[in-house]
């Protein structure tokens, strides 16, 4: 399964509106920065078959809409740009899926990919738990903001590696 | 490879103004923060404030609030640091500091070469 | 406004010492504390991050350590290139503040 060109440019156009998403000031939230510990092995391509790298990819679009399409994160962000920002990620979801499906009937996953979907996993849950811990305050948000544009980067930089391989 | 190019050296009255640029090339510029630092002569550092330009608004340190403007242009990838009403206090060397892509705005990683601005009647 | 003391201001050494550094903060930052290194007429290095991660492409030599309130750089053996002046920074809070400054002179 070739990953579109236009994939890659949702990506791009996601982070481009995740950042005009922002509220506040991140120079005003520093106290309130929070390592959240990124996975950064799974969006390593080079050690994973495609079925794989498609499937951490999904795992982490997939986790970024739920993040973003809660009621907390409504009251959070500016409407129309939280809608523009989740139809990109939604279209993204719908190329990956197509690609998992494909890929996944050439390549058997094996147990490797359920630890890196579980790494995904976790690292959701740290930022889950970070929100709910700070109240959801606007400061928490932007940590959080400034978060997934950084993971959203590292899967930019996973689909060019991607690219290159096919 | 980033690398961050300041204006030329000016000299100013007291009580003008002067605006300093600071190209940036490599990364994405809208993404990332760039902060303004300055060094009086045989002086030590003293940050002034930084912007990120995706996000828009910057952010001043107190002592300088009122006096600077720190803007950004994306379309040239290019920051700007204006400082009003300079006295001869105001005479150092103003350095443009890049921080870390997507990252908090707290470490600078990546320096322009400095402009000298003297402030003299 | 967070206050950042170093010591000594200045200090002579020869080359293949062992150099410390030493920055106070006037609360507690946690571990957000930078060291820059400086040569005269040039920008400022970033040589460690987070108190005491080491930046990329700076010699292992350079080390940090410390939190809360009292922190050290350490150059475990000066070699002739590191004569310059060295800066703390916290970014704990804004307003970002740095050390006056350490100048480490030749012997």
């Known amino acids: 399964c070739d990953l579109p060109q236009t994939h890659s440019l949702g990506n791009r156009r996601a982070l481009i509106l995740l950042g005009q998403m922002g509220r506040i000031s991140p120079f005003s939230c520093l106290k309130d920065r929070h390592d959240f510990r990124i996975p950064q092995e799974e969006f390593d391509g080079n050690q994973f078959q495609k079925a794989q790298a498609i499937s951490v990819l999904h795992e982490m679009i997939q986790q970024t809409f739920n993040l973003f399409s809660t009621e907390d994160s409504s009251a959070a962000w500016e409407q129309s740009l939280l809608e523009k920002f989740s139809t990109e990620l939604y279209q993204q979801l719908n190329d990956l899926e197509a690609c998992v499906i494909q890929e996944v009937g050439v390549e058997e996953t094996p147990l490797m990919n359920e630890d890196s979907i579980l790494a995904v996993r976790k690292y959701f849950q740290r930022i889950t738990l970070y929100l709910i811990e700070r109240k959801y305050s606007p400061c928490a948000w932007e940590v959080v903001r400034a978060e997934i544009m950084r993971s959203l980067s590292f899967s930019t930089n996973l689909q060019k590696r991607l690219r290159r391989k096919d | 490879q980033v690398q961050l190019v300041q204006s030329g050296a000016e000299v100013k009255k007291p009580g003008s103004s002067v605006k300093v640029s600071c190209k940036a090339s490599?990364?994405?510029?809208?993404?990332?923060?760039i902060s303004w630092v300055r060094q009086a002569p045989g002086q030590g550092l003293e940050w002034m404030g930084g912007?990120?330009?995706?996000?828009?608004?910057?952010n001043y340190a107190q002592k300088f609030q009122g006096r600077v403007t720190i803007t950004a242009d994306e379309s040239t990838s290019t920051a700007y640091m204006e400082l009003s009403s300079l006295r001869s206090e105001d005479t150092a060397v103003y350095y443009c500091?890049?921080?870390?892509?997507?990252?908090?705005?707290?470490?600078?990683?990546?320096w322009g070469q400095g402009t000298l601005v003297t402030v003299s009647s | 406004d967070i206050q950042m003391t170093q010591s000594p201001s200045s200090l002579s050494a020869s080359v293949g010492d062992r150099v410390t550094i030493t920055c106070r903060a006037s609360?507690?930052?946690?571990?957000?504390l930078n060291w820059y290194q400086q040569k005269p007429g040039k920008a400022p290095k970033l040589l460690i991050y987070?108190?005491?991660s080491l930046q990329s492409g700076v010699p292992s030599r350079f080390s940090g350590s410390g939190s809360g309130t009292d922190f050290t750089l350490t150059i475990s053996s000066l070699q002739p290139e590191d004569f310059a002046t060295y800066y703390c920074?916290?970014?704990?809070?804004?307003?970002?503040?740095f050390g006056q400054g350490t100048k480490v002179e030749i012997k």
């Open positions: 912007i990120i330009p995706i996000f828009g608004t910057a």
């Open positions: 490599g990364g994405t510029f809208s993404s990332y923060a």
């Open positions: 500091a890049r921080h870390l892509e997507y990252a908090f705005p707290d470490k600078f990683d990546y």
């Open positions: 920074q916290q970014s704990y809070s804004t307003p970002l503040t």
């Open positions: 987070f108190a005491s």
């Open positions: 609360q507690s930052i946690s571990s957000y």
